[in-house]
Structures are given as structure tokens and as C-alpha cells.
């Protein structure tokens, strides 16, 4: 029975040009990780994290995502085309698969200090 | 188009090394993908050895790790194996070959070593 | 070690046929499973990865299918170059593991 469930960063904005984690946290069962993917809005994959063979950044990724931290994936020099949705995919035995989802949003670089200036501390 | 190419010696006698060069051109080694060992036994198993990243990080077949190192030069676009104490049943077909997520999307032709004294 | 168990180790079949090749594997490794052709000779060359994802110019006569733990590649209408040994590989964990193979000759 799967027991677990997947924490993500939820809805997230981040400044052309600069760089974002996206993380996800698998919590409530004792199931074992062995395989993390990440995958972009159009379902390509950005990277996978194995347990036992490390990680693989897709070629065409590599110079704007860097693995980590921990089974994260941090993107870099963001543009606009990045805005969309990305998912985690956590293979766990002897769970199973568990999927999580999160939103980026890519903003002009002054719609997002605009947006910072009106945030509640 | 990338392509790659096995080098070295033929022939290794008993509880030496076995070195190969994997030569590879139309791609460069640092720009993603994993660079791999695989070799072809004579009696059609192939076997997994292990593989270095585009970044340098080495993983090896558990059953392989005492003996084997696999290292690259990046300036000359050439990755390298290494197996110590060979034994004639280290005797197969060794190929290099690029991974992309763990499977093989481009082979060498392949290089014949046998072990004998 | 996860374990590949090829299934038939060799078939005779015409030119036109269709043939299946199955690939039982121990452990689950979901959609993580490739296929290669090997002729005399040659290197072996990428078909399938990801179960049922052809590679790069494979014809669409070359089929996979399956999960988990049950693989299949099937090759409608054979034609003379589909000749060979064909293997399986799950890229799912450490070690990578091949199948025994399969050789299937003309009939």
C-alpha cells in the first residue's frame, strides 16, 4: 500500500535570467528511493537520479541544469520558454511510483522586482 | 557525426593489465552523455563494466570494481579502460560506447583481447 | 544482480513473417528496458530504449511493449537485414545487465 506522499514547492516565480530549485520531498513511508526523474511541461526528460548509477543531465540541458541539492534539480540562466510545469517522478520500492508537480514561472526581470517590492515579509 | 574507436594491444598475458583507448570524434566527451565499457564474451554474453561522466565521475559493475579504472583525457577526446590481474576469462570483444539514461546509442566497432601466456 | 531471461534463444523464421521476442526480467524496472540488433561481426545497435521508444532510424516495423517485469519486441514483416542476434538491457540500476540473446535465422 502506498502511504507516502509527495511535498513539492508548489506554484514558484523566479527572474529571467537567474535561477530556480525545484524540489520535491517524499514523507510518510519508510519506502526506499531508487529512481528520481524530472521531467519538463512537453513530458522530455531533464534529468534522472539513480539510486545506484548517480545522475544523468540530459545533453541538451547540461549547461542550464545542475543536479542537486539532494535529489533537487536547480535551473540556471532562465528565460521565458522555461515557464510551465515540471514533475517529479519518485520510483520507490516496495511503494511503487509517486508523482509530484510543480509550476514555474518565468518573469521579466522588473515585473519580478515589482512583484517582490508587495510581497508580505 | 560522432563516432567512436577501440585501440590497443590484442593480446595480455595472465594476471597483467589490460589498457584500451576509446577514441571518439564528432562529439566531445565533456558535453554531456556517458562514456562506457561493455565487453562480448565468446559465448554471446555481453556484459556491462562501468562509465565515466561527461564531468569525470566514474561508476563500475560491482563484480568488476577491484580491478577496473576507466579515466578520460579531455584534451584529446579519448577515454580510457584499465583491468588488473586479467585471467583468460577476461578473453572477449571490448566495446566503448556513449549512454544516454543508461542505454547505449552509439558502439565502437570493437577491439579482440585475449589473455594468454 | 538484476536478472534477463531472453526467450527463445534462437528462431527460424521467412522473409515477410512477423516474430516476438521476450525479455522476462526479475525485478521490477518499470519502463527502463532497451533493445539492440547485433549482426556477425558488427557492433550491437540501439532499436528501442524506454520499452517502446525507437531510436534514431529504425524502421517502424520494430515494435516494444511491456512493464515491470514482462518485455516484448516484435518485428512485423521481416526483411532480409532484420537477420541477427537481438538483445535486452534494463537501464535501470547498477550493474546494467544484457540478455542471453536471441538468434533468429532465416528459415
Known amino acids: 500500500m502506498m502511504t507516502g506522499t509527495i511535498e513539492t514547492t508548489g506554484n514558484i516565480s523566479a527572474k529571467k535570467g537567474g535561477s530556480v530549485i525545484l524540489q520535491c520531498h517524499l514523507s510518510s513511508t519508510m519506502a526506499q528511493v531508487t529512481q528520481v526523474n524530472w521531467e519538463q511541461h512537453d513530458h522530455s526528460l531533464l534529468a534522472i537520479r539513480n539510486a545506484e548509477l548517480g545522475w544523468h543531465i540530459y545533453p541538451a540541458f547540461k549547461d542550464r541544469v545542475a543536479p542537486g541539492p539532494g535529489l533537487g534539480l536547480t535551473l540556471q540562466s532562465l528565460t521565458m520558454n522555461d515557464t510551465g510545469e515540471y514533475f517529479c517522478t519518485y520510483h520507490t520500492y516496495p511503494d511503487g511510483t509517486y508523482r509530484g508537480r510543480i509550476f514555474l514561472e518565468v518573469l521579466e526581470s522588473s515585473v519580478a522586482e515589482h512583484s517582490a517590492r508587495f510581497q508580505i515579509p | 557525426d560522432v563516432q567512436l574507436q577501440e585501440s590497443g594491444p590484442g593480446l595480455v598475458k595472465p594476471s597483467q593489465s589490460l589498457s584500451l583507448t576509446c577514441t571518439v570524434t564528432?562529439?566531445?566527451?565533456?558535453?554531456?552523455?556517458?562514456w562506457h565499457w561493455i565487453r562480448h564474451f565468446p559465448g554471446n554474453i555481453l556484459e556491462w563494466m562501468g562509465y565515466?561522466?561527461?564531468?569525470?565521475?566514474?561508476i563500475y559493475s560491482p563484480s568488476l570494481k577491484s580491478r577496473i579504472s576507466i579515466t578520460h583525457d579531455t584534451s584529446k577526446n579519448h577515454f580510457f579502460l584499465k583491468l588488473n590481474s586479467v585471467t583468460s576469462e577476461d578473453t572477449a570483444t571490448y566495446y566503448c560506447?556513449?549512454?544516454?539514461?543508461?542505454?547505449?546509442?552509439?558502439w565502437g566497432a570493437g577491439t579482440t583481447v585475449t589473455v594468454s601466456s | 544482480d538484476i536478472q534477463m531471461t531472453q526467450s527463445p534463444a534462437s528462431l527460424s523464421a521467412s522473409v515477410g513473417e512477423t516474430v516476438t521476442i521476450t525479455c522476462r526480467v526479475s525485478?521490477?524496472?518499470?519502463?527502463?528496458l532497451a533493445w539492440y540488433q547485433q549482426k556477425q561481426g558488427k557492433s550491437p545497435q540501439l532499436l528501442v530504449y524506454?520499452?517502446?521508444t525507437l531510436a534514431e532510424g529504425v524502421p517502424s516495423r520494430f515494435s516494444g511493449s511491456g512493464s515491470g517485469t514482462q518485455f516484448s519486441l516484435k518485428i512485423n514483416s521481416l526483411q532480409p537485414e532484420d537477420f541477427g542476434s537481438y538483445y535486452c538491457?534494463?537501464?535501470?540500476?547498477?550493474?546494467?545487465?544484457f540478455g542471453a540473446g536471441t538468434k533468429l535465422e532465416l528459415k
Open positions: 564528432g562529439y566531445s566527451i565533456t558535453s554531456g552523455y556517458d
Open positions: 525485478e521490477n524496472i518499470y519502463s527502463y
Open positions: 565515466i561522466s561527461d564531468s569525470g565521475n566514474t
Open positions: 538491457q534494463h537501464h535501470y540500476g547498477n550493474p546494467l545487465t
Open positions: 524506454n520499452t517502446k
Open positions: 560506447a556513449r549512454g544516454s539514461f543508461w542505454y547505449f546509442d552509439v
